[in-house]
Structure formats: structure tokens, C-alpha cells
């Protein structure tokens, strides 16, 4: 089981949208995948995916989860507030047929205060 998370760094403006992506790959098929997003070590959500669907669509304050086959788990924060700033980690574990687990590298989210004199959002793209 491999987990690749991106972007490494994400800087957005307060009130806008932030998208964090977790790519989950395994050479063999799986029946149920447990996923988890944490922020600064605290669990935001811990749903599972089975039959192509997420058991939960929300993830923390203003967070929405989606699963796009074959491998992309997306956490969308909208609207972003200042307290969304932090270090996000995606973790995944195949529960069926056999326990396998892996986690991504940290995504550091920086939220700039809403200031009309600043440039528009700078959203990094997911590598690969």
C-alpha cells in the first residue's frame, strides 16, 4: 500500500478554498479501505471506502471528502478560515482482505488573512 499526498505546501487566502489530495495505490484489489485525515496530530475524520463509496462526506470544520476512482481521496476546505492553518496528514489502511497501512507526507497549509490588497490565491498542484 502506497500513499502519496500533495501538495507539500499550500498557501491560500482566508475565505477561499483549499484542496488536499491523497493518492492511495495498491497492486492488488481491496474490499474496504479505512482513511484518516489529521491536522496537527488530531483526527479530523476517519471514514472508510467500500463498494466505491465513502462512509462519510464531511471531514472537520468546513471539510468535504470525496473519492475518485481509482486512487484519489480529496479533502476540500471551503471556506478556509485562519484556524485551518496547520500540518495535514493522510493515512490509509486496507482492512479487507488483509491489513496494510501507509501514510503520506505532511501538507502544510498557510492561510493568509483576508486582505484585498494581496494577490489572488496561490494553490500548489498535486505532484505527478
Amino acid at each position: 500500500l502506497s500513499v502519496q499526498q500533495g501538495p507539500n505546501l499550500l498557501q491560500v487566502r482566508q475565505g477561499s478554498q483549499a484542496t488536499l489530495v491523497c493518492q492511495v495505490d495498491q497492486a492488488t484489489a481491496w474490499e474496504r479501505l479505512r482513511v484518516k485525515w489529521t491536522k496537527d496530530g488530531a483526527i479530523l475524520c476517519q471514514p472508510y471506502i467500500t463498494n466505491g463509496s465513502l462512509s462519510l462526506g464531511v471531514c472537520g470544520p468546513q471539510g468535504r471528502l470525496s473519492w475518485q476512482a481509482p486512487s484519489h481521496l480529496t479533502l476540500q476546505l471551503d471556506p478556509v478560515s485562519l484556524n485551518h492553518s496547520g500540518a495535514y496528514v493522510c493515512w490509509a489502511a486496507v482492512e479487507i482482505p488483509e491489513l496494510e497501512e501507509a501514510e503520506g507526507n505532511i501538507t502544510r497549509l498557510f492561510v493568509d488573512p483576508d486582505d484585498p490588497t494581496q494577490n489572488r490565491n496561490r494553490i500548489a498542484s498535486f505532484p505527478g
Epitope: S2, A27, T28, A29, I49, A69
Partner: antibody, heavy 120, light 113 residues
Framework: QVQLQESGPGLVKPSQTLSLTCTVS??????????WSWIRQHPGKGLEWIGY???????YYNPSLKSRVTISVDTSKNQFSLKLSSVTAADTAVYYC????????????WGQGTLVTVSS | DIVMTQSPDSLAVSLGERATINCKSS????????????LNWYQQKPGQPPKLLIY???TRLSGVPDRFSGSGSGTDFTLTISSLQAEDVADYFC?????????FGDGTRLEIK
């Protein structure tokens, strides 16, 4: 360019242990998300998956051979190895090493294969 | 274990004609989670290791001639060579990676008529 090369004795006596090594060049076997695999092919026949070892060190074996198989990795030499104990004539085959990635699920790179004959 | 059954065992086709090889699995290789079929096709020429042609049942590996195509889903799969060339003479194997143990078909020997 990734290359794999099998090495080891071509003749093994019955009841002994078959030992083969696969040397990987052009790629580090410590790279995450890869399965380092052994596959064999009996003369004139189909392919049989023996097992593989994941980057984490976790091993997966074919249940038909599990009691006799050990796959291990030597990261310092960028090699992985196969040991098959208590061999019989039925273990005579061409043995291949190959790699498989989580992002694919297919055997992308193969060694050229080495014929191992079990005979007294 | 998932049993992979290939047919025919051998096949003789004239140059420029179509060759069709079938592969049937004892259980579905389609995952509703990833929307993928866990089925690969390999070509093996004498004295050489197998070479990947098609993955996920229908995706042709980069560099593989477009006369090779894969189709099917679930339990029934087909490898088609639209116009046989002399260099296509080889053994062809299907392989499932839906679950371990990974298993291969027994192979189809393709020859020129």
C-alpha cells in the same frame, strides 16, 4: 534503466536448498511502493508466482510453496534473494526475478531468468 | 486461488490476419472501489522473459504497437492482434493481480499459418 539479474547455482541436489540472488541496478530497492518478486516457469509450461517482498520488508508467498520459501532483501547490495528448501525434480524450472509497483500491479522489469535443475 | 483459463492452447494465423486469444477467470477481476480490472497480458518469445503488453485489461503499454488491444471486464477477457506480423510469433499469457496468490493463464502459443 532498471535492470535485474539472477545468479546462483544451476544444479541443486534433491532435498537440498535452492538459493538465488537478484541484483537490481539503476534503481534503489528501498524506494517505497515496490514488490520484489520471484516467478518460475517449468520447462515448456506456464508461469508460477513464488512470492514477493515489499519495500517494508513484509513478505507474501504462494500458499503452494509457503512452507519451503524465504524471500529476503540485502539493501546494502541492492539485492533480494530466494531460498527454496527440500527441493525435488518438480522444482526444476527457469527462475525469474521481477518488480511490481503499487501504482501498477504488473511485472514491469524482469531478469533474463536462470535455469535451475534439481538432480542428483 | 483465482484460476485463469486461456483458450486456445495454440493458434495458427496467416500474416495480416486477426488473432484472438481468450482468458477467463474463476472470479471477477473488477473492483468497484477502483473501477479497474486487475488483468494483464504478457508476450514471451523463446529464451526471453515475458514482456508486458496490456494492463488493466485494456490499457496498452507505451511503445506496444497499436495492433495489440485488450478488452473485456469481470471474468472474460480478450487479447486481439488486428493484423498479425511475423514478429508476433510468441507465447501469450494473461495474469491476474486482483489478489494473492497472483496467477497466470497456461499460455497460448501463436504461430503463423
Amino acid at each position: 534503466q532498471v535492470q535485474l539479474q539472477e545468479s546462483g547455482p544451476g544444479l541443486v541436489k534433491p532435498s537440498q536448498t535452492l538459493s538465488l540472488t537478484c541484483t537490481v541496478s539503476g534503481f534503489s530497492i528501498t524506494t517505497g511502493g515496490y514488490y520484489w518478486s520471484w516467478i518460475r516457469q517449468h520447462p515448456g509450461k506456464g508461469l508460477e508466482w513464488i512470492g514477493y517482498i515489499y519495500t517494508s520488508g513484509r513478505t507474501y508467498y504462494n500458499p503452494s510453496l509457503k512452507s519451503r520459501v524465504t524471500i529476503s532483501v540485502d539493501t546494502s547490495k541492492n539485492q533480494f534473494s530466494l531460498k527454496l528448501s527440500s527441493v525435488t525434480a518438480a522444482d526444476t524450472a527457469v527462475y525469474y526475478c521481477a518488480d511490481m509497483a503499487d501504482k501498477g500491479g504488473w511485472f514491469a522489469y524482469w531478469g533474463q531468468g536462470t535455469l535451475v535443475t534439481v538432480s542428483s | 486461488d483465482i484460476v485463469m483459463t486461456q483458450s486456445p492452447d495454440s493458434l495458427a494465423v496467416s500474416l495480416g490476419e486477426r488473432a484472438t486469444i481468450n482468458c477467463k477467470s474463476s472470479q471477477s477481476l473488477f473492483s468497484s472501489n477502483t473501477k479497474r480490472n486487475y488483468l494483464n497480458w504478457y508476450q514471451q518469445k523463446p529464451g526471453q522473459p515475458p514482456k508486458l503488453l496490456i494492463y488493466h485489461a485494456s490499457t496498452r503499454l507505451s511503445g506496444v504497437p497499436d495492433r495489440f488491444s485488450g478488452s473485456g471486464s469481470g471474468t472474460d477477457f480478450t487479447l486481439t492482434i488486428s493484423s498479425l506480423q511475423a514478429e508476433d510469433v510468441a507465447d501469450y499469457f494473461c495474469q491476474q493481480h486482483y489478489e494473492t496468490p497472483l496467477t497466470f493463464g497456461d499460455g497460448t502459443r501463436l504461430e503463423i499459418k
